[in-house]
Interface confidence: low
């Protein structure tokens, strides 16, 4: 089975999330400050002319970029696209923001700065007060809260109206922990790192975030090629060399939002064995209900068979037997020189009466600035609300 069951199409996860149509209530829109009540956060809805026509912060955003507009989506969403406008004011508004940054959070405590696939944080904004400028977020971000930080190159007034586009994140995956992806040296270097991981990287381990293994982009048969434009060889895959793991396996841990009964895990793997990539020989998963609890029961073990000689990339389905947990730890056994994964998703059901986890289970956030964002797939359920998704820009899958 080369397809990911339940795999969502990122191009369709582009529904307006409720600023303009007011399904996001005023109480879920806030700001660091407002110039006046008539430019309060609640007036920041795209295409709205309420109040004085936008949110305008009290302070200058130059030189310090500390003012922000915050939208609380209440549940985790994949945010694939944002739209911005300046101040309406009956057509008399002159204030807009030529650029801005985004920060986002899944738990309200740890905030991450959005970056594009090349590490650029600053997003081009508006050139006038009325035009709507849409920005495709590549990579998209999994967030409950999103903050817009308007920028200016001099002391000036800036005002903002916004919309967010995406879909609900139903899979419940909060983070995965994995060893840092490595570089394969062929005729050219193939960079198999998780380049959109938004957690922490410490001592060869990435934890507390999501990244390319949950971004909905399935890798190609030839791992040197990519679905994305203008990226480096190996971009779609995260890979590890057998030589670096004396244990003979790569271990990953997955944290979910609440207790779930897990039916299966789907891992999209490369099997270009002529270049050393092999499906895992087997997978072993352990389960626990809380971060400080013991692993429960026997691990689930699954040996992989099938046509291992077929060099095509494919999804491997690992049955998980309905085991109930909030944390999974899985070991992927090497069957060749390299393991290359492009996606990992889970088929699960929320256990009735289980409360969402409060924030992450990670320590006070370690150092370097959290990287860019993630995305996931059986995670996502489209929520049309009657409207059509915003069409993609031409060119790149994530513009």
């Amino acid at each position: 089975d080369a397809d990911m069951k339940g795999h969502f199409d990122p191009a369709k996860c582009r529904y307006a999330l409720g600023m303009q149509d007011r399904t996001i209530p005023d109480s879920d829109i806030s700001a660091s400050s407002s110039w006046s009540d008539s430019t309060a956060a609640r007036h920041s809805r795209l295409e709205s002319s309420d109040g004085d026509g936008a949110w305008c912060p009290a302070g200058s955003v130059f030189p310090k970029e500390e003012e922000y507009l915050q939208v609380d989506l209440q549940r985790l969403h994949l945010v694939a696209l944002v739209g911005t406008q300046g101040r309406h004011a009956g057509g008399l508004g002159k204030e807009f923001s030529r650029s801005y940054r985004l920060r986002y959070s899944r738990d309200g405590r740890r905030w991450m700065g959005w970056k594009d696939r090349w590490g650029q944080e600053v997003i081009s904004g508006n050139e006038d007060p009325e035009g709507v400028v849409l920005k495709d977020l590549g990579p998209p971000m999994v967030a409950r809260l999103v903050r817009f930080y308007p920028r200016a190159d001099r002391v000036m007034s800036v005002c903002l109206r916004v919309e967010l586009y995406g879909c609900l994140w139903r899979d419940g995956l909060l983070s995965y922990t994995a060893p840092v992806g490595q570089t394969m040296y062929l005729s050219e270097a193939v960079y198999l790192n998780d380049s959109t991981y938004d957690g922490h990287t410490v001592g060869g381990l990435q934890y507390g975030g999501l990244g390319q293994l949950a971004d909905g982009v399935v890798g190609l048969d030839d791992f040197r090629k990519s679905q994305e434009l203008r990226v480096w060889p190996g971009y779609d895959y995260v890979g590890w060399s057998n030589h670096s793991f004396s244990s003979g396996y790569v271990e990953m841990e997955f944290e979910f939002d609440r207790l779930r009964a897990f039916q299966a895990m789907q891992v999209h793997c490369n099997n270009m064995h002529t270049l050393g990539a092999r499906l895992p020989g087997g997978v072993e998963c352990r389960f626990r209900r809380g971060p400080a609890m013991a692993w429960e029961g026997e691990p689930m073990r699954h040996n992989l068979g099938g046509n291992l000689g077929d060099p095509r990339a494919r999804a491997v389905s690992v049955p998980l037997g309905g085991r109930v947990a909030r944390f999974l730890q899985c070991r992927f056994l090497f069957a060749g020189p390299w393991l290359l994964f492009s996606e990992i998703s889970f088929i699960s059901d929320v256990v009735n009466n289980s409360s969402p986890a409060l924030g992450g289970t990670f320590p006070p956030a370690p150092w370097w600035p959290p990287g860019p964002p993630p995305t996931n797939f059986s995670s996502l359920e489209l929520e049309p609300r009657g409207q059509q998704p915003v069409a993609k820009a031409e060119g790149s899958p994530t513009a």
């Epitope: 001592g203 320590p363 006070p364 370690p366």
Partner: antibody, heavy 121, light 107 residues
Framework: QVQLVESGGRVVQPGRSLRLSCTAS????????MLWVRQAPGKGLEWIGT???????YYASWAKGRFTISRDNSKNTLYLQMNSLRAEDTAVYYC???????????????WGQGTLVTVSS | DIQMTQSPSSVSASVGDRVTITCRAS??????LAWYQQKPGKAPKLLIY???SLQSGVPSRFSGSGSGTDFTLTISSLQPEDFATYYC?????????FGGGTKVEIK
């Protein structure tokens, strides 16, 4: 109050083993990265190793194989197991807590008072 | 492993002097650098983290600067209680090396 207290240091013969303890109070050890650092008499600080919140351990190259860091969450205690001790392991051994915040690493803000290990025949 | 080299290893100065201590990393380490002060028989005390940020309660005469591989701790006007040994430390957690230390002595 929030503190770290090391114990277990004593005079030990070369080739023997010793386990040092670092008991935390006022916070949970397993929410932080914890380090062991030592200081030989008249010398500088020397990093031994680190244990992450998830029990991943990292060691200085010279410490690998002879030194093992672990912890008992139920006792809120960090351990340093030292094997095949040598005279050059004579030092004051400190445990320290790595603090972090929204913008990154905030340094080793909390240290124990240290415990002296003397390796001598 | 990254090595941290401090210089000078010792410095003699008088009260009121400006003292500068440098720390050089064997490769670029970004901003994950801290400075500590240690007095004889005592545990180290954190002065500065993240290259520039002053730990709460530390006098403003201490300041940190630098980027990449070269970092500096400056004491703008040395006070009697500042005579001690100072260490830099890099914390990536794959390894966490300290510099060799700089002893600030009374001239």
């Amino acid at each position: 109050q929030v503190q770290l207290v090391e114990s277990g240091g004593r005079v030990v013969q070369p080739g023997r083993s010793l386990r040092l303890s670092c008991t935390a109070s006022g916070f949970s050890l397993n929410r932080y990265y914890m380090l062991w650092v030592r200081q030989a008499p008249g010398k500088g600080l020397e990093w031994i190793g680190t244990i992450s919140y998830g029990d991943t351990t990292y060691y200085a190259s010279w410490a690998k194989g002879r030194f093992t860091i672990s912890r008992d969450n139920s006792k809120n205690t960090l351990y340093l197991q030292m094997n095949s001790l040598r005279a050059e392991d004579t030092a004051v051994y400190y445990c320290a807590r790595a603090d972090t915040g929204d913008n990154g690493y905030l340094g080793l803000q909390l240290w124990g008072q240290g415990t002296l290990v003397t390796v001598s025949s | 492993d990254i090595q941290m080299t401090q210089s000078p290893s010792s410095v003699s100065a008088s009260v009121g002097d400006r003292v500068t201590i440098t720390c050089r990393a064997s490769q670029s380490i970004g901003s994950v650098l801290a400075w500590y002060q240690q007095k004889p028989g005592k545990a180290p005390k954190l002065l500065i983290y993240g290259v520039f940020s002053l730990q709460s309660g530390v006098p403003s005469r201490f300041s940190g600067s630098g980027s990449g591989t070269d970092f500096t701790l400056t004491i703008s006007s040395l006070q009697p209680e500042d005579f001690a040994t100072y260490y830099c430390q890099y914390i990536p957690y794959g390894s966490s090396p300290f510099g060799g230390g700089t002893k600030v002595e009374i001239k």
